[in-house]
């Protein structure tokens, strides 16, 4: 499955929107900084097959979409930017979904790497618990926004996998 060119375009647009969503100076939130431990070591040390990369990317975007679809998120961000950001994520999910569906019929690839799916889920669990602990404060959301931007950039190794022929 070849992901449409629009996918990397959507990814860039999502990042730009996420950058625009910043409402507070990150410097005023230094006391709220937190280490979420994005599983980049696990990802970087692994040569992803295309199907694995697609599944893991889908999980990352799905979790990001869910995170920004909550009532608490709606209260934290400028509505029109949040809607545009969510739409970009939703379109990315559709692109990836179509690819995964194509592969599902095929013999299970090196098991879609459940451990990578779990690593992504645990990462978002840490983010969720942090937001709850900070009572969804504006600074907490700012820290999370910056973290999600970083995680989008970290996932370049996954994106290399997308260009690989299985």
């Amino acid at each position: 499955c070849d992901l449409p060119q629009t996918h990397s375009l959507r990814n860039r647009r999502a990042l730009i929107l996420l950058a625009q969503m910043g409402r507070i100076s990150p410097f005023s939130c230094l006391k709220d900084r937190h280490e979420f431990r994005f599983p980049e070591e696990e990802f970087d040390g692994h040569q992803f097959q295309k199907t694995q990369a697609i599944s893991v990317l889908h999980e990352m975007i799905q979790q990001t979409f869910n995170l920004f679809s909550t009532e608490d998120s709606s209260a934290a961000w400028e509505q029109s930017l949040l809607e545009k950001f969510s739409t970009e994520l939703y379109q990315q999910l559709n692109d990836l979904e179509a690819c995964v569906i194509q592969e599902v019929g095929v013999e299970e690839t090196p098991l879609m790497n459940e451990d990578f799916i779990l690593a992504v889920r645990k990462y978002f669990q840490r983010i969720t618990l942090y937001l709850m602990e900070k009572k969804y404060s504006p600074c907490a959301w700012e820290v999370v926004r910056a973290e999600i931007m970083r995680s989008f950039s970290f996932s370049t190794n996954l994106k290399k996998g997308l260009r690989r022929k299985d």
């Epitope: 990836l96 569906i101 779990l118 669990q125 618990l129 709850m132």
Partner: antibody
């Protein structure tokens, strides 16, 4: 509000198969993995596996790989679990439970379907 | 797989008594992924405590959870009749996800 509807009971003959359903409502079906859990009478809970309704990918507990097959039908917002080659060991209540994070992990369960395997 | 052992299997407590249920993991579980569920006969399990120590919505404040590594516990500071139920610990720190065999808590 989030609801997962499961039929109350299924009576099946040994060696046969059964397909259990779990109809979701109150949330976007494709946004959350759906899990299946087994509970034998008076016993603990066993995780069978999970499926992402968005694209149909599955992750199984090795112990159930040859027993259970998880599928979804997005048009009817329903998750299914097929159990094959049934024996008395498979007589149990089977629950579906929605994934999520933090306080949403397994926060929503179906009522469970009691499967009785009997000649 | 991570085996979760719960003890005792069955216990009874008088109203007002302090109760502690334990869950021991065969290998280390990160506390963020250790959950507790309450189940009453004929019903599906209910999320009771998430990430070791956080009470789920609607759970009375007399309940608390603690622990780390391989040792976790659920405590009721003062037993009430409505607390009589089975309690299961659960981990999703690694595949396959597992549940403890449960502790059945009865009221004296």
């Amino acid at each position: 509000q989030v609801q997962l509807q499961q039929p109350g009971a299924e009576l099946v003959k040994p060696g046969a198969s059964v397909k259990l359903s779990c109809k979701a409502s109150g949330y976007t079906f494709t946004n959350y993995w759906m899990h299946w859990v087994k509970q034998r009478p008076g016993q603990g809970l066993e995780w069978i596996g999970e499926i992402n309704p968005s694209h149909g990918r599955t992750i199984y507990n090795e112990n159930f790989k040859s027993k259970a097959t998880l599928t979804v039908d997005k048009s009817s917002i329903t998750a299914f679990m097929q159990l094959s080659s049934l024996t008395s060991e498979d007589s149990a209540v089977y629950f579906c439970a929605r994934g999520g994070l933090g306080p949403a992990w397994f926060a929503y369960w179906g009522q469970g379907t009691l499967v009785t395997v009997s000649a | 797989q991570i085996v979760l052992t719960q003890s005792p299997a069955i216990m009874s407590a008088s109203p007002g008594e302090k109760v502690t249920l334990t869950c021991s993991a065969g290998s280390s579980v990160d506390s963020s992924y250790l959950y507790w569920y309450q189940q009453k006969p004929g019903s599906s399990p209910k999320l009771w405590i998430y990430s070791t120590s956080n009470l789920a919505s609607g759970v009375p404040a007399r309940f608390s959870g603690s622990g780390s590594g391989t040792s976790y516990s659920l405590t009721i500071s003062s037993m009430e009749a409505e607390d009589a139920a089975s309690y299961f610990c659960h981990q999703w720190s690694s595949y396959p996800f597992t549940f403890g065999s449960g502790t059945k808590l009865e009221i004296k």
